[in-house]
Interface confidence: low
């Protein structure tokens, strides 16, 4: 008669079997895994029982279970089955960065040796593609790009071990509104140590601008944050006679537009 696995957890397996016809005084239940060898369940289930629970098992391991009915000096043919324990789910899923089209997430790995992770990102309130990413077993973070703007996503992180998949660590996150880059950006003045730029913007809510001035000679870049009502800005503290790439971004809370890039040079001393 059959052997069934009725409940599987990370460190335990419940089994059930059909009792044979005739008298049974007790059952011998043995279980083995490649890692831990063979064990016998103690105390042995008595003849009235048809279920047992194996405890203290190794997460994510395959166990071979054998049930033999015993009476006096007689024993039945074994019922044999194979079942793997579950693997624990990742925990503490956090979103470390969110942009209009991407998200970054991190989690705490389960204390089990894995073969990888699967990350599934599904739009919640819009129709759109589900994204699935497979990661190496030593990963504990992911960056998912190519997402839809201003969209609520459910993020599920599964731990994988061979053919086993854990329950997911899950979270919900909304990508940010798109931010338009500045328009018509140009250099309006340059001295030996300053460059002045001006620009225009779309009529949309913003919280400011960011300007990065990167010298071609590899010296330290200069970064400034500018108030939202400003449309002209003088970058100071530059080096004379130096070529700069100037990156100008629109900011809106945590979101940042793509940059407008301006080439400019300071005057020679």
């Amino acid at each position: 008669k059959g052997l069934a696995f009725t409940d599987v957890d990370v460190d335990s397996i419940k089994i059930a079997w059909e009792s044979p016809q005739g008298q049974v005084s007790r059952y011998r239940v043995t279980y083995s895994s490649p890692e831990d060898g063979i064990h016998e369940l103690f105390p042995a289930p008595d003849g009235e029982e048809d279920t047992a629970e194996l405890q203290g098992l190794r997460p994510g391991s395959e166990y071979t279970v054998s049930v033999v009915a015993l009476h006096d000096d007689m024993e039945s043919q074994p019922l044999i089955g194979t079942q793997s324990t579950a693997i624990p789910a990742p925990t503490d899923l956090k979103f470390t960065q969110v942009t209009p089209t991407s998200l970054s997430a991190q989690w705490t790995p389960p204390n089990v040796q894995l073969t990888g992770y699967r990350v599934r990102v599904t739009p919640k309130e819009k129709t759109g593609p589900m994204k699935e990413i497979n990661l190496a077993p030593d990963s504990s973070s992911v960056v998912v790009s190519g997402l839809m703007v201003a969209t609520k996503y459910e993020v599920s992180v599964y731990a994988l071990k061979d053919t086993l998949t854990s329950r997911p660590a899950q979270g919900v996150v909304t990508t940010l509104e798109n931010v338009s880059p500045p328009r018509r950006a140009r250099v309006t003045d340059a001295t030996e140590t300053t460059i002045t730029i001006s620009w225009r913007t779309k009529t949309e809510t913003i919280t400011g601008f960011q300007v990065d001035a990167v010298p071609a000679n590899g010296q330290t870049p200069i970064q400034r944050t500018i108030k939202p009502d400003v449309r002209s800005y003088t970058i100071t503290g530059l080096q004379p006679g130096t070529d700069y790439k100037i990156y100008l971004y629109t900011l809106n809370d945590n979101a940042r537009s793509s940059p407008v890039v301006i080439d400019a040079s300071t005057a020679i001393d």
Epitope: P34, E35, G37, E62, N111, V112, Q113, L114, T115, P137
Partner: antibody, heavy 118, light 108 residues
Framework: EVQLVESGGGLVQPGGSLRLSCAAS????????MSWVRQAPGKGLEWVSA????????YYADSVKGRFTISRDNSKNTLYLQMNSLRAEDTAVYYC???????????WGQGTLVTVSS | EIVLTQSPGTLSLSPGEKATLSCRAS???????LAWYQQKPGQAPRLLIY???SRATGIPDRFSGSGSGTDFTLTISRLEPEDFAVYYC?????????FGQGTKVEIK
Amino acid sequence: EVQLVESGGGLVQPGGSLRLSCAASGFTFSPITMSWVRQAPGKGLEWVSAISGSGGSTYYADSVKGRFTISRDNSKNTLYLQMNSLRAEDTAVYYCAKSTHLYLFDYWGQGTLVTVSS
Amino acid sequence: EIVLTQSPGTLSLSPGEKATLSCRASQSVSLHFLAWYQQKPGQAPRLLIYGASSRATGIPDRFSGSGSGTDFTLTISRLEPEDFAVYYCQQMRGRPPTFGQGTKVEIK
């Protein structure tokens, strides 16, 4: 980058003892099962011993059981193999190996040579 | 213990040729518990394939594994000069884990 660096090998007389060490870096050492695998000169690979991440479970090949002891110090990211009652047939390069499963070795050290000879 | 027998012992081939290495187990090994390693002279072994057919990190796709039960194969589709080495199969289904005796792939 995962790095495993073995040390402690050398020449020892039959019946003598040696303690091998393996310094691990580039990964979170404490939850990972670690093993020692050896290779006699010109021969194939032989698994010697393994230890669970916590150090609570240890496993040995029959050929070394009772003579070798595997241990680890997670605060130092170091794996050890204490080898007693050494025999000529223990002569080999001893590799420290990181496991992804108990016995799947995804990274290996460069090895340390143990020579047992009078 | 499970005994793994590799064949042939030595394989003499030229760069660009296909190499087929065999590993036979004395009893059935779930495909999840079979791995292949490469070892070059004076170096430590390197994991190539696990789970019979999954390539380890950084392993080129000219290496592939297949098989189940007792018969497993490692195939190198086009031999590169750096592929000439000794290859070991390994099972982790039973304790102790065991390795095959190795197949040496040498330049003809």
